[in-house]
């Protein structure tokens, strides 16, 4: 079922079907015998009770006040009253733009990132049974889509998709043809979600080791989901059976990015492992960043100037 009209301030365009649905509808069914009344007041005017006799354009059904269609002089405050329950709305009916297929003040703006999923579905659940056909327009030019009941666009967004999309539902009521227009202003922006990946810690790291022992070199980065982190060493990775790349660990950050950690394990350290570069690289669509590790024999550490360790 269509949800109730909870917004207290509503703007609608003249000439379109419109309805107000109060929010104690389920309650109203329970107490069928209770008196339920709709009122309107505009300006200095007192509350005037509404009924189908007050205007041929107004219809009352259970929880709903319908306008066929709504007109400029329908602007005002509307009240629904039942026992000790009251709901109030302020309705502002604005002029239709005669020179366009939509009225600028009645546009919903949406921002879609390029290459991200972009969808427009023309649906109107309340009037669904009365709708004969629906058309979708882009910048007031009709789009030729297969489904003329619920036209839909589903695609990966591109910059050319930017524009005003208007869903126009055509429906009959009491022998008259009406239309309801819902317009979206779609702005396509660049992918804003990507960060430039950051390798954590110093760019050059000297690690003190002892021959015959093992060492674990930890490379950590803050990165995007599709970014890669890997180790490069020697002429061809994997030529040294004592060197192992451990499984990457990833933890999602509260911002939806990833904290990744990849360990290079070097077992039974030999002379050939000393004073060579073990590079950890993070790569993204924005470029690469590299961090280097050099294994140095513990005894030789004294020869290395202190500033090297914080570079």
């Amino acid at each position: 079922a269509e949800s109730c009209t909870s917004r207290p301030h509503i703007t609608v365009v003249e000439g379109e079907p419109f309805y107000l649905k109060h929010c104690s509808c389920s309650l109203a069914h329970e107490i069928e015998t209770t008196t339920k009344s709709w009122y309107k007041s505009s300006g200095s005017q007192e509350h005037v009770e509404l009924n189908p006799r007050s205007s041929s354009r107004i219809a009352l059904h259970d929880c709903v006040l319908e306008f066929w269609p709504v007109e400029l002089n329908d602007t005002g405050s509307y009240f629904f009253q039942m026992k000790n329950y009251t709901q109030k709305w302020k309705l502002n009916v604005i002029r239709r733009n005669k020179h366009s297929c939509f009225t600028e003040r009645q546009v919903t703006s949406k921002i879609v990132e390029v290459k991200k999923f972009f969808q427009i579905t023309c649906e109107n659940s309340y009037y669904q049974t009365l709708v004969n056909s629906t058309s979708l327009y882009k910048n007031c030019k009709k789009l030729l889509l297969e489904n003329n009941k619920n036209p839909t666009i589903k695609k990966n967004a591109e910059f050319e998709d930017q524009g005003y999309y208007s869903c126009v539902h055509f429906l009959h009521h009491n022998g008259k043809l009406f239309n309801i227009t819902k317009t979206f202003n779609i702005t396509i922006v660049e992918d804003r979600s990507n960060i430039v990946p950051v390798l954590l810690g110093p760019k050059l790291n000297h690690v003190a080791v002892e021959l015959g022992k093992n060492v674990r070199l930890n490379c950590s980065a803050l990165l995007n989901e599709e970014d890669v982190i890997y180790w490069m060493f020697g002429e061809e990775n994997g030529s040294d059976p004592n060197i192992h790349e451990e499984k990457e660990m990833r933890i999602m950050t509260p911002e939806g990015k990833w904290h990744a950690s990849k360990v290079l394990r070097i077992e039974n350290i030999g002379e050939s492992n000393l004073n060579v570069l073990y590079n950890c690289t993070v790569a993204s669509t924005g470029g690469t960043d590299t961090k280097s590790f050099i294994l140095v024999r513990k005894a030789d550490m004294a020869d290395i100037p202190g500033h090297v360790f914080t570079r």
Partner: antibody, heavy 115, light 113 residues
């Protein structure tokens, strides 16, 4: 719209250098790396290297190491590729391309190396 | 370096028929951390720069007709054109962007039979 505009064709003598420019527009320049890809006449595509427009980090193909330099100027959203010590087999169309899968390409710059 | 090998080198297919191009990488381009394949397909027509068709092995680039599709994982990939059109005559390249140097296949020339 998003595009990469490259500098014009060049004719160079062996041993000389060439510098090709690639001006980006329609997107945030520093969000994407710029790769350079070349194509010798009638041949396939060869990746030369790339530069991060964000921090200037570079990564070059091994065979061009020492002869190629890639730079960027973020104030003008322009990437540059300089190739030195030109040889006849460097004759090719040089393309700049965006990102790591190349969704936007320049039109290409023909560099002819001939004595 | 990761070596990309395409097959066949050239291919002749009748209009409206299916065209299939294969690409094999010397090592896996599937990244286990996010289950993505770092592989793209390009189309190049004479005198033009290449045009991106497919990335992440199977995601079609915006504006590319849906007769183009990519499949495969790890080391074996396929580009399929479901119903060949005259404008599809071109050279097609696969490319890995898993590790630098980013490498291309040698290309497959597609012609009409």
């Amino acid at each position: 719209q998003v595009q990469l505009v490259q500098s014009g064709a060049e004719v160079k003598k062996p041993g000389a250098s060439v510098k090709v420019s690639c001006k980006a527009s329609g997107y945030t320049f520093t969000n994407f790396g710029i790769s350079w890809v070349r194509q010798a006449p009638g041949q396939g595509l060869e990746w030369m290297g790339w530069i991060s427009a964000y921090n200037g980090n570079t990564n070059y193909a091994q065979k061009l190491q020492g002869r190629v330099t890639m730079t960027t100027d973020t104030s003008t959203s322009t990437a540059y590729m300089e190739l030195r010590s030109l040889r006849s087999d460097d004759t090719a169309v040089y393309y700049c391309a965006r990102g790591w899968f190349f969704d936007i390409w320049g039109r290409g710059t023909l560099v002819t190396v001939s004595s | 370096d990761i070596v990309m090998t395409q097959s066949p080198d050239s291919l002749a297919v009748s209009l409206g028929e299916r065209a299939t191009i294969n690409c094999k990488s010397s090592q896996s381009v599937l990244y286990s951390s996010n289950n993505k394949n770092y592989l793209a397909w390009y189309q190049q027509k004479p005198g033009q720069p290449p045009k991106l068709l497919i990335y992440w092995a199977s995601t079609r680039e915006s504006g590319v007709p849906d007769r183009f599709s990519g499949s495969g994982s790890g080391t074996d990939f396929t580009l399929t054109i479901s119903s060949l059109q005259a404008e599809d005559v071109a050279v097609y390249y696969c490319q890995q962007y898993y590790r630098t140097p980013y490498t291309f296949g040698q290309g497959t020339k597609l012609e009409i039979k």
